[in-house]
Amino acid sequence: YSHWPSCCPSKGYPSEELLRWSTVPVPPLKPASLDFHSVSCRASEDGPLNSRAISPWRYELDRDLNRLPQDLYHARCLCPHCVSLQTGSHMDPRGNSELLYHNQTVFYRRPCHGKKGNHKGYCLERRLYRVSLACVCVRPRVMG
Amino acid sequence: YSHWPSCCPSKGYPSEELLRWSTVPVPPLKPASLDFHSVSCRASEDGPLNSRAISPWRYELDRDLNRLPQDLYHARCLCPHCVSLQTGSHMDPRGNSELLYHNQTVFYRRPCHGKKGNHKGYCLERRLYRVSLACVCVRPRVMG
């Protein structure tokens, strides 16, 4: 068990330990350095969901040692359009590959200051952080 | 600022306050009671991403007052296959609509017990919790 929030000592325990312990231990996929329009703009017939999708994507690591979780992964679309279901390799201009975003709650570690202004360990500041979760194949918007 | 974890008093502050404060304030969408194969098995030409997707989905609320965050939303696919990019209104069996899962870090509130076994407030237990984020149109797996 970790304990319910109140101020932490600055000696590094349990804050340092918990910061490490709260990261997502395994990335959704090993991040790959693949570019838009690369050879990966195809839908595989095996492998993980993000490579079999007709809106394929890769994951990009976003690491911040002063944030909890320290490691976040952002989806990056590999194609502007969707990949054809017919062949798995040609693009279909009738569909767009769009990022799905989510505002995730994260905590940033900030120095705490006591009443006299002296350093009193570390506190957490809660923020909403926009993360791209996946790429989704959508029909283009029709402008009214 | 909230403070870095250590044990909390059981009187409800700051634990109760923080539990509420840490929930995601706005759901991704108002959850709807739509069934598989319903009229919603179509890709809209406007509206949010989950209704324009050719693997459309709805969100289902998962609320637990003893969990942080209290409110999580699970994606539920509206179609077994993908919706045709040509029409947006009929299914294309060459593609499957599959759930994308993510193991999210959550914290459960549990009673803390002191060295003598007496109730010492509330502690947090960290767990990985599987959440479905979206539905993705994929090429079916080819079994080797």
């Epitope: 201009p93 009738r94 | 179509r42 045709s84 029409t87 947006g88 209104s89 009929h90």
Partner: antibody, heavy 121, light 113 residues
């Protein structure tokens, strides 16, 4: 050989609902998509919408708010309802079949003979 | 929506001469997966429904005389009547079935000069 025949009133009052039926003979209504198309006097062709045997519909966005297409597989018929009509809805209304090949819809063939609907008080 | 634009609006050709009708789409109707153009041509004679002539931009329907031919790809298409006959007097329409809503050109009226 599949044949299509439109039927319904030839005169409809403004603000009322236009109702037409297309009867399919010489073949089953299943396995195909069925469209309504109209042509105002001296004008071009405008697609209204389609339906399949399961009742899945798709409408032209320009008419979507006023159109309902339904199917009755037991009678081998599909129907069109267009509400709140005005003089601009005066047209020859055609029904037509669309084949589905490789999970995609194709050209219109065959067509019904068409029925003239006049909107007038 | 994909807008289909035909030219000319009307055409007068002598019997036995060539008639050429153009059709432009506001976006490509070529699907690279199967290398097909999702475009059809119809002939409509007075008082009759349209009749399918050509599909996939260049494939003649069964029973259509070989004087009718379709060509083009992407967004530019042509219907050619190589030797105009009296029975070819009609209005000709192009139509895309690449994506809904299905749309037609405004029509080209072919007459005898």
């Amino acid at each position: 050989q599949v044949q299509l025949q439109e039927s319904g009133p030839g005169l409809v009052k403004p603000s009322e609902t236009l109702s037409l039926t297309c009867t399919v003979s010489g073949g089953s209504i299943s396995s195909y998509f069925w469209s309504w198309i109209r042509q105002a006097p001296g004008k071009g062709l405008e697609w209204i919408g389609f339906i399949d045997y399961s009742g899945s519909t798709n409408y032209n966005p320009s008419l979507k708010s006023r159109v309902t297409i339904s199917v009755d597989t037991s009678k081998n018929q599909f129907s069109l309802k267009l509400n709140s009509v005005t003089a601009a809805d005066t047209a020859v209304y055609y029904c037509a079949r669309q084949e589905i090949i490789n999970f995609e819809l194709n050209w219109f063939d065959p067509w019904g003979q068409g029925t003239l609907v006049t909107v007038s008080s | 929506d994909i807008v289909m634009t035909q030219s000319p609006a009307s055409l007068a050709v002598s019997l036995g001469e060539r008639a050429t009708i153009n059709c432009k789409s506001s976006q490509s109707v070529l699907y690279s997966s199967n290398n097909k153009n999702y475009l059809a041509w119809y002939q409509q004679k007075p008082g009759q429904p349209p009749n399918l002539l050509i599909y996939w931009s260049s494939t003649r329907d069964s029973g259509v005389p070989d004087r009718f031919s379709g060509s083009g790809s992407g967004a530019d298409f042509t219907l050619t009547i190589s030797s105009l006959q009296a029975e070819d007097v009609a209005v000709y329409y192009c139509q895309q079935y690449f994506s809904t809503p299905w749309t037609f050109g405004q029509g080209t009226k072919v007459e005898i000069k």
